[in-house]
């Protein structure tokens, strides 16, 4: 018979032969042959593989480094990685939670809608027209543009969400 060019789900092609993949939690020791099945071995302590695979090495569980404010939220198994979270009052910097911050800052162009609490991080909002923020802050709201008119001045440069308007003297010259 013709050697296969494609294999079924949970199989892989090697040496013109379809071999079974190793199940999650196990790594490949040796490929199958015409006479033998694929040989797999369970991952060791602190290792995992989360898919059907032909990996010869298991992945190390993530380390939740207490020096970065991390602690274990869910212990890893042979089939799943460890999930880290931050100590109480701290917040993950990303979905992967690789480090912790007290709170995130709102970038220029954004103001603080709600200051962080022990359970929720800073909530930012874009500065609407007529308001600006030129700083990165965890407490400052968007500031209103300066009103040139109330100072008997005129707008020389329009404001943006990151900059205030620039006021200047009124042109007294009349043609």
């Amino acid at each position: 018979p013709e050697p296969p060019t494609a294999c079924r789900e949970k199989q892989y092609l090697i040496n013109s032969q379809c071999c079974s993949l190793c199940q999650p939690g196990q790594k490949l020791v040796s490929d199958c042959t015409e006479f033998t099945e694929t040989e797999c071995l369970p991952c060791g302590e602190s290792e995992f593989l989360d898919t059907w695979n032909r990996e010869t090495h298991c992945h190390q569980h993530k380390y939740c480094d207490p020096n970065l404010g991390l602690r274990v939220q869910q212990k890893g198994t042979s089939e799943t990685d460890t999930i880290c979270t931050c100590e109480e009052g701290w917040h993950c910097t990303s979905e992967a939670c690789e480090s912790c911050v007290l709170h995130r800052s709102c970038s220029p162009g954004f103001g603080v809608k709600q200051i962080a609490t022990g359970v929720s991080d800073t909530i930012c909002e874009p500065c609407p027209v007529g308001f600006f923020s030129n700083v990165s802050s965890a407490f400052e709201k968007c500031h209103p543009w300066t009103s040139c008119e109330t100072k008997d001045l005129v707008v020389q440069q329009a404001g943006t969400n990151k900059t205030d308007v620039v006021c200047g003297p009124q042109d007294r010259l009349r043609a």
Partner: nanobody
């Protein structure tokens, strides 16, 4: 790497005053927003006060408004917290924090005990 060192804590009677300092070394201090936090025994972290990089804007938690004053001296790379009319519930370890507020910038804190 930035290092923050808090000082000025101690034992004080209710109604008394203390001035906390936070000295920053190894990094630029000027222009950065700074915060004071506190942690009472067995409680979580509480945001106390903040000051903008320019020093023009400040924030105070409701529990300390009118009693505490935050300030900064960029020439000395130092942040201050003047605490007046102290109460028993102000007893905590006080920490300062600098943008980007990461855990590895966290100081040792200074203990404030308000008791008669």
């Amino acid at each position: 790497e930035v290092q923050l060192m808090e000082s000025g804590g101690g034992l004080v009677q209710p109604g008394g005053s203390l001035r906390l300092s936070c000295a920053a070394s190894g990094s630029t201090f000027a222009g950065y927003e700074m915060w004071w936090y506190r942690q009472a025994p067995g409680k979580g972290l509480e945001r106390v006060s903040a000051i903008s990089g320019s020093g023009r804007s400040t924030y105070y938690a409701d529990s300390v408004k009118g009693r505490f004053t935050i300030s900064r001296d960029d020439s000395k790379n130092t942040l201050y917290l003047q605490m007046n009319s102290l109460r028993a519930e102000d007893t905590a370890v006080y920490y300062c924090a600098k943008d980007p507020y990461s855990f590895d910038y966290w100081g040792q804190g200074t203990l404030v005990t308000v008791s008669s």
